[in-house]
């Protein structure tokens, strides 16, 4: 028997520095977690103690904090190289700055293979990107070899900016021939490493013949055996065992997100490459694990540029950006409109001639808008200003909801109107009319939504049984501010970009902004 230790991360999302327990900015260092310096300490400890160790990342290193905004992926390559990652799979967010924003900072600089079997380049890009990412890689580990085959969510064109010269194929269809190829090369231990979410990870384990282990990402799935060490609630045991169609027991793992845990899986193979046993658990990277001093020093050196960036002008406003709770929790506010417009703009993807865009709607809890921005400061808007408006370090995510769920969400928005509560929704691509004289739960009298399958966008009444795409804060997608119906009834949820980054990019693009209050939210009284 031969034992392999797989260390794995996924969805780190730019958390190079240690964070608080909820993966936001570290405030009290004695209670902070994660970060590459602490991760390195643990990885090195395991490398010293165990013979056959692989360190793998299942994608979405890009996007999530000011580190990515400023360094644009150079920080990912630098610190992953420093940690000596053995392989990485491409995630959807690796394409956030287009293909060039992947090639130059990461693909050309990484000293480890970057993988995806289901992304095929065409046209002029094919030769430019050739060899910079691979469908699979055979890695020597001790006296043996291990094949790593990569995959990426085929929804990436809807979630990021891969351009028109990359084709995202069905994961299972694309993986099978690559695994077969590895078999012909006498590689009998194969790990599928990828970024398509836990449901697809399980399907790959079930359907792709020859895959021994699946290491996944995208869905931020936390798996654990026994009593979990922090706040995350396990979606199942670690590893999650799937019985494949050909009768094998295939371990599937994922390690939550944000570098909070290091996935730790021990696999025992027989001489023919069959998995005999698998066990392990994610390791919580809490303050009991010291940060490596040399990596920490490097982080501090890179940090200097971030502090300078946060006071630079991103763009100008020529109007007062009303982010006051007196406005945003009671009526349409222009800060809410600005943020929603930025959220939609960040999700412009012309992937189908029938649609001007795949999504037209945004909702945003008024309580998430924490500050106004005064235009009488020469109109200057900085990252620092935006951090006061959006201080929670969330993301703006893409969900699919039924019309009936949206209607219920808008009822919740005003169910206790007048108490300055945070659930009052700001909107984009939506016209809503409330009648507060009606009973709570029955106050939405008109709800019109901007069409997507149209060449000239116009507002049409919501249909209860239709499925709609909506951009919203991850806080709402997770049921925050009492929006349990969104969490319970959503049909799909994909994590998006860092909230401040979305708004800052929009302001930089527009250069001068002047958002208005324009009748997106109205109040009426009378018969309907």
């Amino acid at each position: 028997a031969w034992e392999l230790t797989i260390l794995h991360t996924n969805d780190v999302h730019s958390r190079l520095e240690q964070t608080s327990e909820d993966s936001s900015k570290c405030v009290n260092a004695s209670r902070c977690m994660g970060g590459v310096a602490r991760l390195f300490t643990k990885v090195q400890q395991i490398r010293r103690a165990e013979p056959n160790v692989l360190l793998l990342d299942a994608g979405d290193q890009y996007q999530g904090t000011i580190w990515f905004t400023v360094y644009k992926g150079a920080e990912v390559a630098h610190f992953m190289n420093a940690l000596r990652y053995d392989a990485m799979a491409l995630g959807n967010h690796e394409f956030d700055n287009g293909v060039e924003g992947l090639i130059e900072p990461l693909l050309k600089e990484a000293k480890f293979p970057i993988l995806s079997a289901n992304i095929k380049a065409k046209g002029p890009l094919a030769s430019q990107i050739s060899g910079l990412y691979l469908p699979y890689k055979v890695l020597p580990v001790g006296d043996e070899v291990v094949g790593i085959v990569g995959y990426t969510s085929k929804e990436t064109p809807f979630l990021s900016n891969p351009g028109t010269n990359l084709v995202f194929e069905d994961e299972i269809t694309a993986l099978q021939p690559e695994v077969d190829k590895l078999k012909t090369l006498n590689v009998n231990k194969i790990i599928a490493l990828g970024h398509s979410g836990f449901e697809m990870d399980k399907l790959i384990a079930q359907k792709v013949r020859g895959v021994d282990v699946v290491v996944g990402g995208h869905s931020n799935t936390f798996l654990y055996t026994g009593n979990p060490p922090s706040k995350e609630v396990p979606a199942g045991k670690y590893p999650f065992i799937v019985t494949s169609d050909d009768g094998r027991k295939v371990p599937v793992v994922q390690a939550y997100a944000f570098g909070k845990y290091l996935g730790y899986l021990k696999i025992e193979f027989d001489e023919r490459g069959n998995v005999i046993s698998s066990h392990g658990n994610p390791i919580l990277l809490n303050s009991s694990i010291p940060e490596d001093p040399s990596i920490k020093a490097d982080i501090n050196k890179w940090r200097i540029k971030l502090d300078n960036y946060s006071t630079q002008e991103l763009g100008k406003t020529i109007v007062y950006l009303d982010g006051s709770s007196q406005s945003c929790r009671f009526r349409e506010c222009n800060m809410g409109n600005l943020i929603c417009d930025a959220m939609i703009n960040n999700n412009l993807r012309h992937t189908d001639e029938m649609f001007w865009n795949h999504v037209s709607m945004c909702i945003l809890n008024g309580g998430g808008i924490r500050s106004p921005i005064d235009e009488r400061n020469n109109g200057t808007i900085t990252w620092e200003n935006l951090a006061a408006v959006l201080p929670f370090g969330g993301t703006f995510d893409l969900v699919q909801l039924k019309g009936s769920t949206l209607k219920k969400a808008f009822e919740h928005s005003v169910h206790r109107y007048g108490q300055s509560t945070g659930e009052f929704l700001q909107v984009g691509g939506i016209h809503v009319v409330y009648d507060l004289s009606r009973k709570p739960g029955d106050r939405v009298v008109k709800l019109d939504v901007l069409c997507t399958k149209c060449r000239v966008p116009s507002y049409d009444p919501l249909k209860m049984d239709e499925v709609y795409k909506v951009i919203l804060p991850n806080f709402l997608a997770n049921g925050g501010d009492g929006f349990q119906m969104i969490k319970d009834e959503l049909l799909r949820h994909d994590s998006g970009d860092q909230d401040i980054n979305v708004v800052s990019t929009y302001i930089s693009k527009m250069k001068v902004i002047y958002p208005a209050v324009e009748g997106r939210i109205k109040f009426s009284t009378g018969s309907h």
């Epitope: 009936s404 769920t405 739960g441 939405v444 009298v445 019109d448 009444p461 919501l462 249909k463 209860m464």
Partner: antibody, heavy 120, light 107 residues
Framework: QVTLKESGPGILQPSQTLSLTCSFS??????????VSWIRQPSGKGLEWLAH???????RYNPSLKSRLTISKDTSSNQVFLKITSVDTADTATYYC????????????WGQGTLVTVSA | DIQMTQSPAALSASVGETVTITCRAS??????LAWYQQKQGKSPQLLVY???ILADGVPSRFSGSGSGTQYSLKINSLQPEDFGTFYC?????????FGGGTKMEIK
């Protein structure tokens, strides 16, 4: 006020096509958000939703009967039609049309119903 | 498709009594439920929507409740005009199916 009234052949033979008309007033299907459904009720039995048409000509059908149903509308004359092909005795029922706004899921206004008997 | 199962199929009760009719969905319908009353030879009339909101003109002795797959309609202090057949209907997704009905007679 809102009123709906169904009309049909009363009696027809198996294998024929049933044509029903719903004439309504008090609202218009040219108004965004309006819709009309057909629902039937065999004598002494429960209600079965058949089909729905939205203001924008979007249609919904009960999957168990979809191949036999066609719903349509004439906006200018305030009418909605339902055709059921290849009828047999199991299609004997009172047929109702009902109004349903797109923002609601319920039927707030119903017609009085028209009895259709399929008999050889 | 979601099936709606009503119980009881029939019941007899006296004026002044309190009765409860239940409706079970074969899947989670997330409170998207309406109740109707139908009198002999008449068309159904909306009583309750969104599980618990009374339609205009419906007396407050009627109340709806429930969540997930289990829902109920309660009538306090039955009045003579309350007798008839009651139907639940879900509108979580098309097809918008009805329950089999509960026939309520005067004892």
């Amino acid at each position: 006020q809102v009123t709906l009234k169904e009309s049909g052949p009363g009696i027809l033979q198996p294998s024929q096509t049933l044509s029903l008309t719903c004439s309504f007033s008090g609202f218009s299907l040219s108004t965004s958000g309006m819709g009309v459904s057909w629902i039937r009720q065999p004598s002494g039995k429960g209600l079965e939703w058949l089909a729905h048409i939205y203001w924008d000509d979007d249609k919904r059908y009960n999957p168990s009967l979809k191949s036999r149903l066609t719903i349509s509308k004439d906006t200018s004359s305030n009418q909605v039609f339902l055709k059921i092909t290849s009828v047999d005795t199991a299609d004997t029922a009172t047929y109702y049309c009902a109004r349903r706004r797109s923002l609601d899921g319920w039927f707030a206004y119903w017609g009085q119903g028209t009895l259709v008997t399929v008999s050889a | 498709d979601i099936q709606m199962t009503q119980s009881p199929a029939a019941l007899s009760a006296s004026v002044g009594e309190t009765v409860t009719i239940t409706c079970r969905a074969s899947g989670n319908i997330h409170n998207y439920l309406a109740w109707y009353q139908q009198k002999q030879g008449k068309s159904p009339q909306l009583l309750v929507y969104n599980t618990q909101i009374l339609a205009d003109g419906v007396p407050s002795r009627f109340s709806g409740s429930g969540s997930g797959t289990q829902y109920s309609l309660k009538i306090n202090s039955l009045q003579p005009e309350d007798f008839g057949t009651f139907y639940c209907q879900h509108f979580w997704d098309s097809p918008w199916t009805f329950g089999g009905g509960t026939k309520m007679e005067i004892k």
